[in-house]
């Protein structure tokens, strides 16, 4: 983060906790002004590296529901619908921030947590290791 | 989230703000115990729908740096290295949570914000619209 001389309009924080513990307003502001109908909604079926989405719910986490991608095949789907095992379907992973209730069950106290989620899959050329 | 009769060990919150404003510890806990060096690191080059990563920095946001994927081609790369325009490279997008300083420049007050980021690209069969 950044440390800027305190505005008089800023909520106060005791320096001993600063900037470790901050106040966060949970009323989410959505920057995606127009709901993008494309998003990734049908790509999981149309991709040459198709994936299934699995629901992961954890009430101690915020957001409590995360959908995780799992590639359907080791290889990639060819135009004829068969799987080409000379190519690899691999998950595209991203580290995201979530809020974890801490202490557990406390309704208004959280800790930032980084988790790795698989968002979708892509088809890559495999790395071939040549043995001498 | 969950609301359970308040633990005596929970930080207090005034009901008028509850559960809108919460305390968040910014000392990030990393659930990804072993940093996977593979992750998606080289997929952006090896993919049949390769992408470039663009740095997006915003000091009023936490995390301040986000890397965004942009597909290199409209089509997908074939085994011979040429681009097949009968297929489409498309971005895989994900909605993620970030913290936005609010009021602006305040070091210890944030609001949750949802933003749509492109994580990588995948190769899909195009949707063909047949005209009668």
């Amino acid at each position: 983060g950044i440390a800027i001389p305190r505005n008089s309009g800023c909520p106060n924080s005791e320096d001993k906790n600063f900037p470790r513990t901050v106040m966060v307003n949970l009323n989410i502001h959505n920057r995606n002004t127009s709901t993008n109908p494309k998003r990734s909604s049908d790509y999981y079926n149309r991709s040459t590296s198709p994936w299934n989405l699995h629901r992961n719910e954890d009430p101690e986490r915020y957001p409590s529901v995360i959908w995780e991608a799992k590639c359907r095949h080791l290889g990639c789907v060819k135009a004829d619908g068969n799987v080409d095992y000379h190519m690899n379907s691999v998950p595209i992973q991203q580290e995201i921030l979530v809020l974890r209730r801490e202490p557990r069950h406390c309704p208004n106290s959280f800790r930032l947590e980084k988790i790795l989620v698989s968002v979708g899959c892509t088809c890559v050329t495999p790395i071939v290791h040549h043995v001498a | 989230g969950i609301a359970i009769p308040r633990n005596s060990g929970c930080p207090n919150s005034e009901d008028k703000n509850f559960p809108r404003t919460v305390m968040v510890n910014l000392n990030i806990h990393n659930r990804n115990t072993s940093t996977n060096p593979k992750r998606s690191s080289d997929y952006y080059n090896r993919s049949t729908s390769p992408w470039n990563l663009h740095r997006n920095e915003d000091p009023e946001r936490y995390p301040s740096v986000i890397w965004e994927a942009k597909c290199r081609h409209l089509g997908c790369v074939k085994a011979d290295g040429n681009v097949d325009y009968h297929m489409n490279s498309v971005p895989i997008q994900q909605e993620i949570l970030v913290l936005r300083r609010e009021p602006r420049h305040c070091p210890n007050s944030f609001r949750l914000e949802k933003i749509l980021v492109s994580v990588g690209c995948t190769c899909v069969t195009p949707i063909v619209h047949h005209v009668a």
Partner: antibody, heavy 123, light 106 residues
Framework: EVQLVQSGAEVKKPGASVKVSCKAS????????VHWVRQAPGQGLEWIGV????????AYNQKFEGRVTMTADTSTSTAYMELRSLRSDDTAVYYC????????????????WGQGTLVTVSS | EIVLTQSPDFQSVTPKEKVTITCSAS?????MHWFQQKPDQSPKLWIY???NLASGVPSRFSGSGSGTDYTLTINSLEAEDAATYYC?????????FGQGTKLEIK
């Protein structure tokens, strides 16, 4: 005002398929999952499954796996539930209901329900 | 799957009486939701995450419990409370509901 408006009643023959729609309004469609629940005449509630309109992710009750398909069209904020190979014991009122993925003042529960669609399976 | 068993199935109650409906789970669950349903109406969320009243629910209702045993209580029954009440768990797939408890006003 949050509303989930479902398609009208259907009468189907055994072995046929039915597709029920659920049009959402008054909220951001991709911020909530859509769950489907059914209720046979004079009986209790039975969970069929869920779709996340944002990702297209689905999770089905194993009892319906292979016979059910849930889809969502984010451009029209409409969710669909198709049930195939209908049997007489599929006669029920089918409800769609939303479930929050994010917070605000959300209860993380099925907080708004459609009016229900009666599906009658009879030869 | 987790089986939820409500008790009683049916109860005929006098106004102002205290009513207790129990929901017993075949395995431990994190939280319980409760829904109210009146004839020819869709279910309504009534109590969420064990003890929180949904918007518009009168304060005479309360919920409690943990593990396998959960309770919905009406402190002083009113005529408008006549309905069927269902408990519901979301701790494991498939999500399941209790068979329902029908409350009738004497």
């Amino acid at each position: 005002e949050v509303q989930l408006v479902q398609s009208g009643a259907e009468v189907k023959k055994p072995g046929a398929s039915v597709k029920v729609s659920c049009k959402a309004s008054g909220y951001t469609f991709t911020d909530y999952e859509v769950h489907w629940v059914r209720q046979a005449p004079g009986q209790g509630l039975e969970w069929i499954g869920v779709i996340d309109p944002g990702t297209g992710g689905v999770a089905y009750n194993q009892k319906f796996e292979g016979r059910v398909t849930m889809t969502a069209d984010t451009s029209t904020s409409t969710a669909y539930m198709e049930l195939r190979s209908l049997r007489s014991d599929d006669t029920a009122v089918y409800y769609c209901t939303r479930y929050s993925l994010f917070y605000g003042s959300s209860p993380y529960a099925m907080d708004y329900w459609g009016q229900g669609t009666l599906v009658t399976v009879s030869s | 799957e987790i089986v939820l068993t409500q008790s009683p199935d049916f109860q005929s109650v006098t106004p102002k009486e205290k009513v207790t409906i129990t929901c017993s789970a075949s395995s431990s669950v994190n939280y319980m939701h409760w829904f109210q349903q009146k004839p020819d109406q869709s279910p309504k969320l009534w109590i969420y995450r064990t003890s929180n009243l949904a918007s518009g629910v009168p304060s005479r209702f309360s919920g409690s419990g943990s593990g396998t045993d959960y309770t919905l209580t009406i402190n002083s029954l009113e005529a408008e409370d006549a309905a069927t009440y269902y408990c519901q768990q979301r701790s494991s797939y498939p999500w399941t509901f209790g068979q329902g408890t029908k409350l009738e006003i004497k």
